[in-house]
Amino acid sequence: QVPPQYPPIQSIRVQFTRCENEKGCIITSPSKDETMKVQDNSIIINCDGFYLISLKGYFSEELSLSLYYRKGRGPLFSLSKVTSVDSIGVAYLAFKDKVYFNVTTHSTSYKDIQVNGGELILIHQNPGGFCAY
Amino acid sequence: QVPPQYPPIQSIRVQFTRCENEKGCIITSPSKDETMKVQDNSIIINCDGFYLISLKGYFSEELSLSLYYRKGRGPLFSLSKVTSVDSIGVAYLAFKDKVYFNVTTHSTSYKDIQVNGGELILIHQNPGGFCAY
Amino acid sequence: QVPPQYPPIQSIRVQFTRCENEKGCIITSPSKDETMKVQDNSIIINCDGFYLISLKGYFSEELSLSLYYRKGRGPLFSLSKVTSVDSIGVAYLAFKDKVYFNVTTHSTSYKDIQVNGGELILIHQNPGGFCAY
């Protein structure tokens, strides 16, 4: 008998090369075969459970950046007046959540912020839990 | 044929709203359906393997905080003279280990320390390994 | 019917007690039953996917340390002029990658650097993906 295989784990790596002041960061998924999807600059959560979240990036100017997942809830990450980020976190997310950026710059210029090495990774930690597709 | 499902991963999120000087933090599990259990203010480890550990909290006064798992072993986390914690770690834990806090304050007052956003998450990373229930 | 078991997750914990200036750290795997292998002071990657990486150590002198995975790619970790490291990261690694150290000291002495608590952990986060053995 063939040993059971793991169904694919819900995970995604998105990249971002620019962020818009008072808005968010433009995220793209470089791989076609990710198990999670991007929609309207947000990562769509289909499965309940803990997620490992990794956020990296180097910004062309000082900014304040937050990563949200649900209206009315506090951010997953919140960084104030930084030019880079390299953070890891764990959070419980659920079906219908959407992970998205909010960015504010402190310059009078309202130009886009350029980003090098901008990367956001989400990896589901509770396969076997509830999922809705 | 139905594809195999994942058995539930051993994981738990506990909350703590106060810590006792020279003792530990009072932990409660908000969810009934956690796959790990709390006993005597300790999280009980039933499965051998690596665990992802996330610890967060904001304290009402400066304290030193350690998170232990086994008598005679060094702490999983150790923070000296802090008013907040937001740390992630990986550690190998085994059946019979118990994860618990030790706290020391620097004030002459021996009052309890209040905690906002106190959260400890453990997520097993090696399903398929040895477990004893 | 017996519920399906998880096949073992690709993971490894290696230890290192010394590092050689201008070279790397001498890594050994204390456990015989690791699911990943060490070869020529490198950890061999057989499975594509995200990896959770934990790096810890206390060094007998100040050094700069990088952890690489592929020629011509930037490091997974890079620390400058430190006497200790306690870092966690997430990275996408693939079949044929090799994870290894590079170390530089700032002393005129070219002696080995002693390490206490030197530990590198890799845990695959995408079981079910491509593996080559």
Epitope: - | G74 | K56, S109, K111, D112, Q114
Partner: antibody, heavy 120, light 106 residues
């Protein structure tokens, strides 16, 4: 000025237990590796145990492994050595020692020592 | 485990050079530290990293290390240098001391 003061030494019976303390001042305790070193009467120095600044890494000489535990309370600027299952050969003066930063874990400052006597 | 070998005792004439040796397998690849301990006192670090002197240690103390031998040299021994001298290295996460050399200044 750096000071290290050991205490807790005593006369104890074989298989007994004892906890030594070392209170330090004059430096930021949590930034430094600490060690215990012992010296049996009329004999040389023997390293006993190492602990990192944050207390997360500990190592021991083979002779005391699983019997002794080194720990520290950075809030109290205090280093500890919990000794159990004591043997007559553990009789010695016990010194705590602070590392010299980034100098190969050389022992820059020592306390005056505390005497532990194990005898029936 | 790693072993450091020192001669138990050594005599030196006042104001003459004294050489105290510490032997170990390929000790030249390790960093050696030296301590002086006078009767009834705690040890004092006198040389670290083979040849570096901490602040306050007289210039007459120097160190060298190569091959299988590390050497502590006192260029002109004084009466106050009469003491026990210990070498120390780290190996495989453990510290090792030599057995010590008692220096008598004649």
């Amino acid at each position: 000025e750096v000071h290290l003061v050991e205490s807790g030494g005593d006369l104890v019976k074989p298989e007994g237990s004892l906890r030594l303390s070392c209170v330090v001042s004059g430096f930021t305790f949590s930034n430094y590796v600490m060690n215990w070193v012992r010296q049996a009467p009329g004999k040389g120095l023997q390293w006993v145990a190492f602990i990192s600044g944050d207390g997360r890494s500990t190592t021991y000489t083979d002779a005391v492994k699983s019997r002794f535990t080194i720990s520290r309370d950075n809030a109290k600027n205090t280093l500890y050595l919990q000794m159990s299952s004591l043997r007559t050969e553990d009789t010695a003066i016990y010194f705590c020692a602070k590392e010299k930063y980034s100098s190969g874990w050389s022992f820059e400052y020592w306390g005056q020592g505390t005497l532990v006597t194990v005898s029936s | 485990s790693y072993v450091l070998t020192q001669l138990p005792s050594k005599n030196v004439t006042l104001k003459q050079p004294a050489h105290i040796t510490c032997g170990g397998d390929n000790i030249g690849s390790k960093s050696v530290h030296w301590y002086q301990q006078k009767l009834g006192q705690a040890p004092v670090l006198i040389i670290y990293y083979d040849s570096s002197r901490p602040t306050g240690i007289p210039e007459r103390f120097s160190g060298a290390n190569s091959g299988n031998t590390a050497t502590l040299t006192i260029s002109g021994a004084l009466a106050e240098d009469e003491a026990d001298y210990y070498c120390q290295v780290w190996d495989s996460s453990a510290s090792v001391f030599g057995g010590g050399t008692h220096l008598t200044v004649l």
